[in-house]
């Protein structure tokens, strides 16, 4: 059995699950351990920017005390020389994001650090239901490099239910990653940053158009999973990664065969963390229901390397370290569908704190 975070003592053994995924086990993970933030920064305040050279050279495990931004040379800020005065934003200049979109200075932003001992076990959080995610090779899907990430646009028909009466349809999926020697997930667990993270973005069926849902509670829902290194190649991810060379240039878009989107997520859809946050890129609209799975998805070292070196972004720089710093919870509670807190009792705690999308 893969071991979870709860109640781990001493040296845990890393079990293999048939789907090639493991539970979140911080002590076991090959990527570097990032120290958790000591406390939430003051309201509406971004952590200080960290110089890229300082960040890459001083790998003392302390950098996530300020959850640093991606280095300036990775995603340099842009002027008007490209795109005719576009509202540019970059991972190297997240302190400027509120100027691009005021919502980025909101109180309930994403991503966040998931502190396991502070999660609230919520028994009403049922296993997620995915319908229609097993796509056939035809029709083909658009895979693009938009300069910030690699994006797979999903067709109509992928339906997901967070719970009774909370139905969504998938719009697209994208990834966040680091470099070969620095992890790049957006969410962290007890301060630990994983090599990479997948986001599947969904629109509530209560809204016919995206712009109507932005900023509305429960209007958007994102399924997130951490990518972790393992010896075996992940065949599902290979169907994406094998095409990255074709979209290496910013702005490239190709058509690839349809694939089983559910195979890109963990097999265990019953154990997850849930909170209300925001889009992690401008316009940083709030009201987004986040589901972060406890089980990680396993990719080979070669696959993670391919992800981190294949794409190019603005100003002929590598598209790397495309993650936002973790944001203060500002009083939010992260709920868990299982007893994740190490000292959790068999009975659910804070059971009345459970929220539903749209509350």
């Amino acid at each position: 059995q893969p071991q979870g975070l709860s109640g781990m003592q001493g040296e845990p053994s890393l079990g293999d699950s048939s789907s090639g995924e493991d539970e979140l086990g911080v002590d076991v993970l090959p990527s570097e351990e990032d120290a958790p933030e000591e406390a939430d920064p003051p309201d509406g305040e971004d952590p200080p920017e960290v110089n890229s050279e300082d960040r890459m050279e001083e790998s003392l495990g302390l950098e996530d005390l300020s959850t640093p931004e991606a280095p300036e040379h990775s995603q340099g800020s842009h002027g008007d020389e490209k795109g005719g005065g576009h509202s540019h934003w970059s991972y190297g200049g997240t302190l400027l994001w509120p100027q691009v979109s005021p919502a980025c200075a909101g109180r309930f932003q994403s991503p966040v650090d998931i502190r396991l001992e502070r999660t609230a076990f919520c028994r009403t959080l049922q296993p997620l239901e995915l319908l229609g995610y097993e796509l056939q090779p035809l029709p083909e899907l658009s895979l693009s490099n938009n300069g910030h990430t690699v994006q797979l646009t999903l067709p109509p028909g992928l339906k997901m239910a967070l719970g009774p009466g909370q139905e969504y349809r998938a719009l697209q999926l994208h990834l966040h990653w680091g470099t070969s020697d620095h992890p790049g997930s957006e969410h962290t667990v007890n301060g630990h940053r994983f090599p990479a993270e997948i986001h599947v973005v969904h629109l509530s069926t209560a809204f016919s158009e995206l712009h109507e849902a932005l900023g509305r509670p429960g209007g958007l829902a994102v399924l997130a999973a951490f990518l972790q290194e393992s010896p075996e190649e992940n065949s599902a991810y290979e169907q994406l990664l094998s095409h990255l060379e074709e979209i290496s240039e910013e702005g490239s878009k190709i058509e690839i065969p349809g694939l089983d989107v559910s195979a890109l997520l963990p097999s265990d859809l019953s154990r997850y963390y849930r909170y209300e946050g925001s889009l992690t890129t401008p316009p940083c609209s709030q009201g987004v229901i986040w589901t972060v799975f406890n089980e990680t998805v396993k990719l080979s070292a070669k696959q993670l390397h391919t992800l981190s070196v294949s794409l190019w972004g603005p100003r002929d720089s590598r598209l790397q370290l495309n993650f936002r710093a973790t944001q203060p919870l500002n009083g939010r509670t992260i709920e868990a569908s299982f007893p994740a807190a190490e000292d959790s009792s068999p009975e659910p705690v804070h059971v009345n704190s459970c929220f539903t999308a749209g509350d």
């Epitope: 795109g83 509202s87 970059s90 910030h148 900023g215 702005g251 890129t281 316009p283 603005p314």
Partner: nanobody, 117 residues
Framework: QVQLQESGGGLVQPGGSLRLSCAAS???????????VAWYRQAPGKQRELVAV???????KYSDSVKGRFTISRDNAKNTILLQMNSLKPEDTAVYYC????????WGQGTQVTVSS
């Protein structure tokens, strides 16, 4: 509802110029500024192909067949995408579509460009 409306197409002689415009109407301001915007074209009997794009990160990319002749730009204040087409060739004849891509795709109805003497 977000709607994209192209204009500026027409009949032009080889070597001539046209300026296509695409206006986004509806409550799209909170999407448009953060989207990748693009022009595609579809010639009779052929697949739709990407002509030019401005990514959400601000970079521009052109298909090899239009490089140096076409220029894409955007005006976020007016929610408008422009395509300046110079030195037009008969093979540029197609229906041109504008596209806004932010979490989901938005498409215009298209405008016909015909290059013929």
């Amino acid at each position: 509802q977000v709607q994209l409306q192209e204009s500026g197409g027409g009949l032009v002689q080889p070597g001539g110029s046209l300026r296509l415009s695409c206006a986004a109407s509806g409550n799209s301001a909170n999407i448009f500024s953060f989207a990748s915007v693009a022009w595609y074209r579809q010639a009779p009997g052929k697949q739709r192909e990407l002509v030019a794009v401005i990514t959400s990160a601000g970079g521009t990319k052109y298909s090899d067949s239009v490089k140096g002749r076409f220029t894409i730009s955007r005006d976020n204040a007016k929610n408008t995408i422009l395509l300046q087409m110079n030195s037009l060739k008969p093979e540029d004849t197609a229906v041109y579509y504008c596209n806004v891509d932010y979490l989901q795709d938005y498409w215009g109805q298209g405008t016909q460009v015909t290059v013929s003497s």
